[in-house]
């Protein structure tokens, strides 16, 4: 079927970066400036995305791939393919409808984006707070009481997967 289709449809021979031009007897024509086709057999080329205003160009448009945008400093991407730019706040703040607001007491945000989250409640696990939380970071809980008993082993357990830089950086 594929072979038959290609015999019947000359457009299937048009590679990425071209389109099948009905106005020119279905020959493969290069995509015009500021347009692209990322797959073969296209009957039109797509208009390149333009990174304007708060968006800036991360990757230029080519005849075979669309431009990619990111956000100017002070903003970060949201949505698939960076469809929106949202204002950064400082660590210890969150973005509200009225702008950046400090985290309420008992909450923290260690990033320039996202919302303030509650400090960990160490006492839920029977642990104490060794270092208080701040607006910018969570508390440090003590170890479990079992770790501190006279018979406790000092052997280091195997490391779980830790996020790079959680803020252990």
């Amino acid at each position: 079927f594929e072979r038959t289709r290609s015999l019947q449809d000359p457009c299937s021979n048009c590679p990425a970066g071209t389109f099948c031009d009905n106005n020119r007897n279905q020959i493969c024509s290069p995509c015009p400036p500021n347009s692209f086709s990322s797959a073969g057999g296209q009957r039109t080329c797509d208009i390149c995305r333009q990174c304007k205003g708060v968006f800036r160009t991360r990757k230029e448009c080519s005849s075979t791939s669309n431009a990619e945008c990111d956000c100017t400093p002070g903003f970060h991407c949201l949505g698939a393919g960076c469809s929106m730019c949202e204002q950064d706040c400082k660590q210890g703040q969150e973005l509200t409808k009225k702008g950046c607001k400090d985290c309420c007491f008992g909450t923290f945000n260690d990033q320039k984006r996202g919302i303030c989250r509650p400090w960990t409640n160490c006492s839920l696990d029977g642990k104490s707070v060794l270092v208080n939380g701040t607006k910018e970071r969570d508390v440090v809980c003590g170890p479990s009481p079992a770790d501190l008993s006279p018979g406790a082993s000092s052997v280091t357990p195997p490391a779980p997967a830790r996020e790079p830089g959680h803020s252990p950086q």
């Epitope: 960990t120 060794l130 270092v131 970071r137 280091t156 959680h166 803020s167």
Partner: nanobody, 114 residues
């Protein structure tokens, strides 16, 4: 596997000083020191966070200081005016903000003679 290695323990006379070091194979946000005397529970000595916040047990305040070299994943316990009751095995610990997981070194013996 995370490795923590203490060094600097030893025998010292009362009133003397020692400096303990702990080197970690990874990066952590909360680095501490604990001690355990024979037959007793392991007790908190000092802790420092990556941003420099510190907390020391009341029994060592004014005598011990904790510091760190974040770039080298190493932290230190400077112990001055040592007393016989400071005799114990000293363990370094590593954890993260909000984490219930602790990593421990193997311990280094500190003995203070009178």
């Amino acid at each position: 596997q995370v490795q923590l290695q203490e060094s600097g323990g030893g025998l010292v006379q009362a009133g003397g000083s020692l400096r303990l070091s702990c080197a970690a194979s990874g990066s952590f946000n909360a680095m501490g020191w604990w001690r355990q005397a024979p037959g007793k529970q392991r007790e908190f000595v000092a802790i420092i966070t990556r941003d420099g916040s510190t907390n020391l047990a009341d029994s060592v305040k004014g005598r011990f200081t904790i510091s760190s070299d974040n770039a080298k994943n190493t932290w230190f316990l400077q112990m001055n005016s040592l007393k016989p009751e400071d005799t114990a095995v000293y363990y370094c610990s590593a954890s993260d903000y909000g984490s219930s997981l602790y990593y421990w070194g193997q311990g280094t013996q500190v003995t203070v003679s009178s």
